[in-house]
Amino acid sequence: IPKQSATLRALVRETLTLLSTHRTLLKGNETLRISVPAHKNHQLCIEEIFQGIDTLKNQTTQGEALATLFQNLSLIKKHIDLQKQKCGEERRRVKQFLDYLQEFLAVINTEWTIEG
Amino acid sequence: IPKQSATLRALVRETLTLLSTHRTLLKGNETLRISVPAHKNHQLCIEEIFQGIDTLKNQTTQGEALATLFQNLSLIKKHIDLQKQKCGEERRRVKQFLDYLQEFLAVINTEWTIEG
């Protein structure tokens, strides 16, 4: 569904822009502390990232601009949840599973930050 | 901990080799079906991948060679679990969280398969 793909990409780009624009507003609370993963394997930490976003949302005075930002982040979360559903939907033959496992291991080997 | 990093890379490489070598043994069960994610965002599907490995392990007659393969996969799983623990260990300032969030969104934008 290329349209949906294009829409998500646009949404992420817009969110990055809003994040840049409203940094000062967002980091207003100097005492607030939020969980930040200690590594760069972002996809492993989806839950914690969105918990952090919720903490930020609850601690920030909402203006219209920030409302759009948090709304975008919520839509991104919905998309990710859909992707997570697709992890277990398809039951395939052992051959296909082995091909996927081989690829997964290659990804760990080349792309993951595996220190520590 | 570069030593540990090097060890994991070696472990993953050895596992890939074992997987290639023992494909025929592994795919013996023609009727067995295993969940295969419908997309390439592997890190979102860790749980399902290792559930699939367990299914395969329980359905396969264990020889010494296969024992090593499944042992390796179990060690890789342990490492990933350690990484997952590190998602929520560090409580940092908003500034650092925003930096991480920005990086996460950039990764979605450039690296994820976000079709459909």
Epitope: E90, R91, R92, R93, K95, Q96, D99, Y100, Q102, E103, A106, V107 | R33, V36, P37, A38, H39, K40, E111, T113, E115, G116
Partner: antibody
Framework: QVQLVQSGAEVKKPGASVKVSCKAS????????INWVRQAPGQGLEWIGY????????RYNQKFKGRATLTVDKSTSTAYMELSSLRSEDTAVYYC????????????WGQGTLVTVSS | DIQMTQSPSSLSASVGDRVTITCKAS??????LSWIQQKPGKAPKTLIH???RLIDGVPSRFSGSGSGQDFTLTISSLQPEDFATYYC?????????FGQGTKVEIK
């Protein structure tokens, strides 16, 4: 938009080899498998194999194993299908097709490349 | 290898007719079947995947059904642009295999 553009028609002698290219654009090349399918004149479709551009892992239809070689060049987002020891019955249109997900349906097809094997 | 048997191999129909093509797999392929349309001299085009899921942009007059071994493609009201050859494809197991095709001609 997502596109697969194949190389032009080829005429080859029996015993020779042919290498057909398939250039991908409009998406992240390493995120989707590329399948190869052929169609002899007036005949149906036949699957040759697939390659995963992420890790170069390929899988072949036993019928073509040893004669077909699937490769990719990630730097140019191009997939290749080489067929060796050509015989007249290899005369066909060769298509590349993108896999939508993992071992999923073919959502985008190349325009096809006619390979003629004739002495 | 899984054999895919398609029937009929050809049929003649008029615009507005309801057309049904069937495909039988030699073993259980779950729902991993797609229907492909090909017009003369053109590249194939996938219409339906996972047995009954219509691909974006494909007219709703096309529908698919079935699971296991028996599958059906239905065109509810044949249009002039639907005259083509239709193939089923199983992508449940390697090697992927196609049906021999059904040519839909104008009566």
């Amino acid at each position: 938009q997502v596109q697969l553009v194949q190389s032009g028609a080829e005429v080859k002698k029996p015993g020779a080899s042919v290498k057909v290219s398939c250039k991908a654009s409009g998406y992240t090349f390493t995120n989707h498998h590329i399948n190869w399918v052929r169609q002899a004149p007036g005949q149906g479709l036949e699957w040759i194999g697939y390659i995963n551009p992420y890790n170069d892992y390929s899988r072949y239809n036993q019928k073509f194993k040893g004669r077909a070689t699937l490769t990719v060049d990630k730097s140019t987002s191009t997939a290749y299908m080489e067929l060796s020891s050509l015989r007249s019955e290899d005369t066909a249109v060769y298509y590349c097709a993108r896999d939508y997900g993992n071992f999923w349906y073919f959502d985008v097809w190349g325009q096809g490349t006619l390979v003629t094997v004739s002495s | 290898d899984i054999q895919m048997t398609q029937s009929p191999s050809s049929l003649s129909a008029s615009v507005g007719d309801r057309v049904t093509i069937t495909c039988k797999a030699s073993q259980d392929i779950n729902s991993y079947l797609s229907w492909i349309q090909q017009k003369p001299g053109k590249a194939p085009k996938t219409l339906i995947h996972r047995a009954d899921r219509l691909i974006d942009g494909v007219p709703s007059r096309f529908s698919g059904s079935g699971s296991g071994q028996d599958f059906t493609l239905t065109i509810s009201s044949l249009q002039p642009e639907d005259f083509a050859t239709y193939y089923c494809l199983q992508y449940d197991d390697f090697p992927y295999t196609f049906g021999q095709g059904t040519k839909v001609e104008i009566k």
